[in-house]
């Protein structure tokens, strides 16, 4: 035990009085701390710490996990320690598998031994693989094995602590070494665009890309000659182990003229710093002017093609262009391109190609274009001339015959009655009711006409023709009556009569 000068506080005395103690698993650990000012026992192994206020530390049945440093401390803060090994052939190592190492620094593989008398305490690669040739280590049974000067190449290295016991090699659980790289160069910085010209009120957004070996690189946007903190948003990615990328996006949601100036993206690490700049010039309000290249009212025949073409001036550059029909946006069939490839070009062309137009495709086609200041639109009214289509031809519950036709221009419906089996229907019948229907349902872009006549007027077998016609053409449908006693019966139209 250490000796001290009289009058000075002395460290506590521990029994047994040796620095190391080896016990077998299952045996008793009995440690006595003698000191008039005894405060506590402390047990430490790996990250575990236990305390005991009794001056005698007793562990009745020792386990491998009781291996560690037992320290007795007195009220003067003086202490004495004994290291206890609990020899357990089934558990030669205590392990903390977390293993991080900073590049070029030493790191400890924490696999202290429970038996100091085993031999060849060392590191081995997993699955029999050899360790890197330049990997050096220093074993310490009480702490683990220190890897000297960690290299970046050791990242994700799989290791075991190893000892020889009775001539056989015994391995610990595996460790995976995670290497934190050291900075050996300044960050690499780049900017999405070197200069911006914006209209007042437009959003200014610029992205700086910072590349380095790890995420602990520092970066910020600064405004030259200003201390104002700028609003930034970050996205980051790890492309492999030591290839980190951050995108720092600076946004001024509504730029003003006095926001003009030079903005610097600055980054630094422990090795040094780097920066890149972008210039913002804000001028006042933008504009869009649209010029139709064809008449905005278009008549086209069913099945024909038509191209809707506009030219427009836009500054700043147009951000969104779309052609819309019936609240639906075209995803194809249109193209939008600058009138010239000149950097300062502000004139553009947009073309919508409508092919083989159907009667259901008439209506308003709208071109919309916007930049951050202005929205502009122009509408083309497209009328598709279509031969009438007879949608329905029904005898109603109330005895009416109803014929519904659609077409453009608006169809006219005439009614004819042919008595018996005559092939020509010439006797015209006046309708009881004619309505132009709301065409919100199918079909859109055509005009829908509904006409009704009273079928009770027909007292003899015959055929009723509904004829719908307009400037484009005509269509007929036929309804046949046959009387059985006092009952009027509908007969298959196509079996009795071929128009």
């Amino acid at each position: 035990q250490p000796s001290v000068s009289p009058g000075e506080p002395s460290p506590p005395s521990i029994h047994p009085g040796k620095s190391d103690l080896i016990v077998r698993v299952g045996d008793e650990i009995r440690l006595l701390c003698t000191d008039p000012g005894f405060v506590k026992w402390t047990f430490e192994i790996l990250d575990e710490t236990n305390e005991n206020k009794q001056n005698e530390w007793i562990t009745e049945k020792a386990e491998a996990t009781n291996t560690g440093k037992y320290t007795c401390t007195n009220k003067h803060g003086l202490s004495n320690s004994i290291y206890v090994f609990v020899r357990d052939p089934a558990k030669l190592f205590l392990v903390d598998r977390s293993l991080y190492g900073k590049e070029d620094n030493d790191t400890l593989v924490r696999c202290p031994l429970t038996d100091p008398e085993v031999t060849n305490y060392s590191l081995k690669g997993c699955q029999g693989k050899p360790l890197p040739k330049d990997l050096r280590f220093i074993p310490d049974p009480k702490a683990g094995i220190m890897i000297k000067s960690v290299k970046r190449a050791y990242h994700r290295l799989c290791l075991h602590c190893s000892v020889d016991q009775e001539g056989k090699s015994v391995l610990s659980e595996k460790f995976i070494l995670k290497v934190r790289p050291a900075f050996k160069a300044v960050p690499v910085v780049s900017v999405s665009k070197a200069s911006y010209l914006l209209r007042e009120g437009e959003e200014f957004t610029v992205t700086c890309t910072i590349k380095d070996v790890s995420s602990s690189v520092y970066s910020t946007w600064k405004r030259e000659n200003s201390q104002t903190k700028l609003q930034e948003k970050y996205n980051s990615w790890h492309h492999g182990d030591f290839n980190y990328e951050r995108q720092a996006t600076l946004t001024i949601s509504s730029a003003r003229v006095n926001d003009s100036g030079v903005f610097m993206c600055y980054a630094n690490n422990t090795f040094g710093s780097a920066n890149v700049t972008t210039t913002l010039e804000v001028v006042d309000k933008g504009f869009i002017n649209i010029f139709p290249m064809i008449n905005t009212t278009v008549f086209v025949n069913d099945g024909e093609n038509v191209d809707l073409i506009v030219e427009y001036e836009a500054f700043p550059k147009p951000e969104h262009q779309q052609w819309i029909y019936m609240n639906r946006t075209f995803t194809d069939k249109w193209e939008d391109y600058p009138k010239s490839e000149n950097e300062s070009n502000i004139r553009y062309v947009s073309e919508l190609h409508l092919t083989r137009l159907k009667g259901t495709e008439g209506g308003t086609y709208t071109f919309l274009v916007s930049n951050s200041d202005v929205n502009a639109a122009i509408a083309f009214n497209v009328y598709v001339n279509t031969k009438p289509e007879i949608l329905t031809y029904d005898r109603l519950v109330n005895g009416m015959l109803q014929c519904v036709a659609a077409g453009f221009p608006e169809p006219t419906i005439d009614w004819y009655f042919c008595p018996g089996t005559e092939q020509r229907c010439s006797a015209s019948v006046l309708p009881v009711d004619v309505q132009t229907l709301n065409s919100s349902g199918p079909p859109f872009g055509k005009l829908v006409v509904q006409s009704s006549i009273d079928s009770s007027a027909f007292k003899h077998n015959g055929t009723v023709e509904c004829k719908a016609y307009n400037d484009v053409g005509k269509t007929s449908a036929y309804f046949n009556f046959a009387f059985k006693g006092n009952n009027k019966e509908q007969i298959h139209p196509h079996t009795l009569f071929t128009p």
């Epitope: 159907k358 031969k387 109603l396 349902g441």
Partner: antibody, heavy 122, light 108 residues
Framework: QVQLVESWGGVAQPGRSLRLSCAAS????????MHWVRQAPGKGLEWVAV????????YYADSVKGRFTISRDNSKNTLYLQMNSLRAEDTAVYYC???????????????WGQGTLVTVSS | SELTQDPAVSVALGQTVRITCQGD??????ASWYQQKPEQAPVLVIY???SRPSGIPDRFSGSSSGNTASLTITGAQAEDEADYYC????????????FGGGTKLTVL
Amino acid sequence: QVQLVESWGGVAQPGRSLRLSCAASGFTFSSFAMHWVRQAPGKGLEWVAVTSYDGSNEYYADSVKGRFTISRDNSKNTLYLQMNSLRAEDTAVYYCAKAMVRGVTFGDLDYWGQGTLVTVSS
Amino acid sequence: SELTQDPAVSVALGQTVRITCQGDSLRSYYASWYQQKPEQAPVLVIYGENSRPSGIPDRFSGSSSGNTASLTITGAQAEDEADYYCNSRDSSGTHLRVFGGGTKLTVL
């Protein structure tokens, strides 16, 4: 006599496409609107689409609008249904059917094909 | 469905059975009726006020009252066991037609 014969249906994965055809005979094909109606296994009939007698107009059930296209070739007396972006719920027997009234698009269906099974499954 | 049918109906052989279909559009428009036997295509049996396509026996008849259409089979036969679907305009103002959910007729 009137005959409507659908092509063999088949199995398709969700998101894929399939094309059905229906060969017509025994009537003046070009004078009548033609419909597709489907029936999911163990379920009722559901109208799918119609094309007018000359093919110039088409109408669709909301459940297939934008995914299915009905068409006809009057020179070949054949009706088609192009089915894109198929979903599991499109699994059904598909029938082609003839409109009863000449020249009228919507109305009763007096002749039906034998039906063809389309299975959409991954 | 905008047209509502009872899921199942049964009838003794030779007796009369009525299958009904309800829907707003039936106040103005007649329903047509389709018969479908297992593994077969539907067959039109009644259309219009009460018309039968050729080949349909006269024991099948149709009628209409208010918002209800009915298919009546007078003297049901074993071969009449099938699913029956009504069909009419939808009630939304379009010209599309809709089917009822179908009624399974069992002949005992």
